[in-house]
Interface confidence: medium
């Protein structure tokens, strides 16, 4: 850049770029000021005057520094199924999760969950795997010799048999092992 | 590199239309602004207007608004400019331009030739 | 619209000589002046943008001045390569305007 040139705006020299948090305007030909997160354009600079931000009204944000036209809008309040982990700001989108006992079905662009669903319960002779599915739901494993689950639940694993000194019923994947009374 | 790459020279009849492209190669087309640029046979150099690469919005020096019109496809880093109902005095090189302050790469100029 | 007024339309001079070429705005222009060189069957050629500003790759010798109305492209020491037409224009307003251009000949 010339050394005279500072302030925006300015004429950059031709071809070359703005620098950081500052952008291009074709229309001006200048390298003219972004506005801040929480804030948008509300005058285009020109020749001789920068840009003219202000503040996104209620229930609108930008979280990047911008040049636009217009704040962006929050998404609608979380819904019964879900908890709100991070508010709608001036400077942030609302971000919602699910409650317990719910997955995320189908996610937004910012990571907020968009509609829960019920989490899948994993039957007699089946535990709940330590890992998730890629939509985050319940994946559910058969009992491996050894271990069992008699419940149909979303959170119970596959627990050992227990050991017995004498035993009376082998158990299986589904109930547990019976031990012999001790005489 | 940077390089504007002009369609080749047309020899059109009176009231035809002509549509000459510029093809933008080595940087981000949609930052830069378009320039057009007419040239009549050993004339000087005539400020035709420009189209704003993001928005896709032309501007027209009032001699230039009706029978022309600037275009683009982006997908393509490709800006058009149009004429119709063509005379014997729009005879000239056309150039597209990047930029408008200070117009650093040029096109290399097509010549449209309008003869009966 | 602004009219660029460029003197001499021609100007005579041998290699190694000062070659000043002037252009007048009919309005204030700030210093939104640009100087273009053209050579036969070429497209211009950038040389200053600013009224004052070197464009990248272009020899020292070759220096813009002025602002408002009045501006000067000089070339200190005439090349042979340097024989050509040379064009201001302005950008401060719409329409955007060339002067008529100065034909730089050798004597």
């Known amino acids: 850049l010339p050394a005279q040139v500072a302030f925006t705006p300015y004429a950059p020299e031709p071809g070359s770029t703005c620098r950081l948090r500052e952008y291009y305007d074709q229309t001006a030909q200048m390298c003219c000021a972004k506005c801040p997160p929480g804030q948008y354009v509300k005058h285009f600079c020109n020749k001789t005057s920068d840009t003219v931000c202000a503040d996104c009204e209620a229930s609108m944000y930008t979280q990047v520094w911008n040049q636009f036209r217009t704040c962006l809008s929050c998404s609608s309040s979380c819904t019964t199924d879900q908890v709100e982990i991070r508010a709608c700001t001036k400077q942030q989108n609302r971000v919602c999760a699910c409650e317990a006992g719910r997955y995320c079905a189908l996610k937004t662009h910012s990571g907020s969950c968009r509609q829960c669903m019920r989490l899948s319960k994993c039957g007699p002779g089946f535990g709940v795997a330590s890992s998730r599915a890629p939509n985050g739901n319940v994946l559910c494993k058969a009992c491996a010799p050894g271990t069992f689950s008699d419940t149909t639940s979303s959170t119970d694993v596959c627990r050992p048999h227990r050991i017995c000194s004498i035993l009376a019923i082998p158990g299986n994947a589904s109930t547990d092992a019976v031990c012999a009374p001790e005489s | 590199q940077i390089q504007l790459v002009q369609s080749g020279a047309e020899v059109k009849k009176p009231g035809a239309s002509v549509k000459v492209s510029c093809k933008a190669s080595g940087y981000t087309f949609t930052t830069y602004g378009m320039s057009w640029v007419r040239q009549a046979p050993g004339q000087g150099l005539e400020w035709m207007g420009w189209?704003?690469?993001?928005?896709?919005?032309?501007t027209y020096a009032d001699d230039f608004k009706g029978r022309f019109a600037f275009t683009l496809d982006t997908s393509t880093s490709t800006a058009y400019m149009e004429l119709r109902s063509l005379r014997s005095d729009d005879t000239a090189v056309y150039y597209c331009?990047?930029?408008?302050?200070?117009?650093?790469?040029w096109g290399q100029g097509t010549l449209v030739t309008v003869s009966s | 619209e602004i009219v660029m007024t460029q003197s001499p339309a021609t100007l005579s001079l041998s290699p190694g000589e000062r070659a000043t070429l002037s252009c007048k705005a009919s309005?204030?222009?700030?210093?939104?002046v640009s100087w273009y060189q053209q050579k036969p069957g070429q497209a211009p050629r950038l040389l200053i943008y600013g009224a004052s500003n070197r464009y990248t790759g272009i020899p020292a010798r070759f220096s813009g001045s002025g602002s408002a109305t009045d501006f000067t492209l000089t070339i200190s020491s005439l090349q042979p390569e340097d024989f050509a037409v040379y064009y201001c224009g302005q950008s401060y307003t719409y329409p955007y305007t060339f002067g008529q251009g100065t034909k730089l000949e050798i004597k």
């Open positions: 189209i704003h690469t993001y928005s896709g919005v032309p």
């Open positions: 331009a990047r930029g408008l302050y200070g117009v650093d790469y």
């Open positions: 309005e204030n222009v700030v210093t939104y």
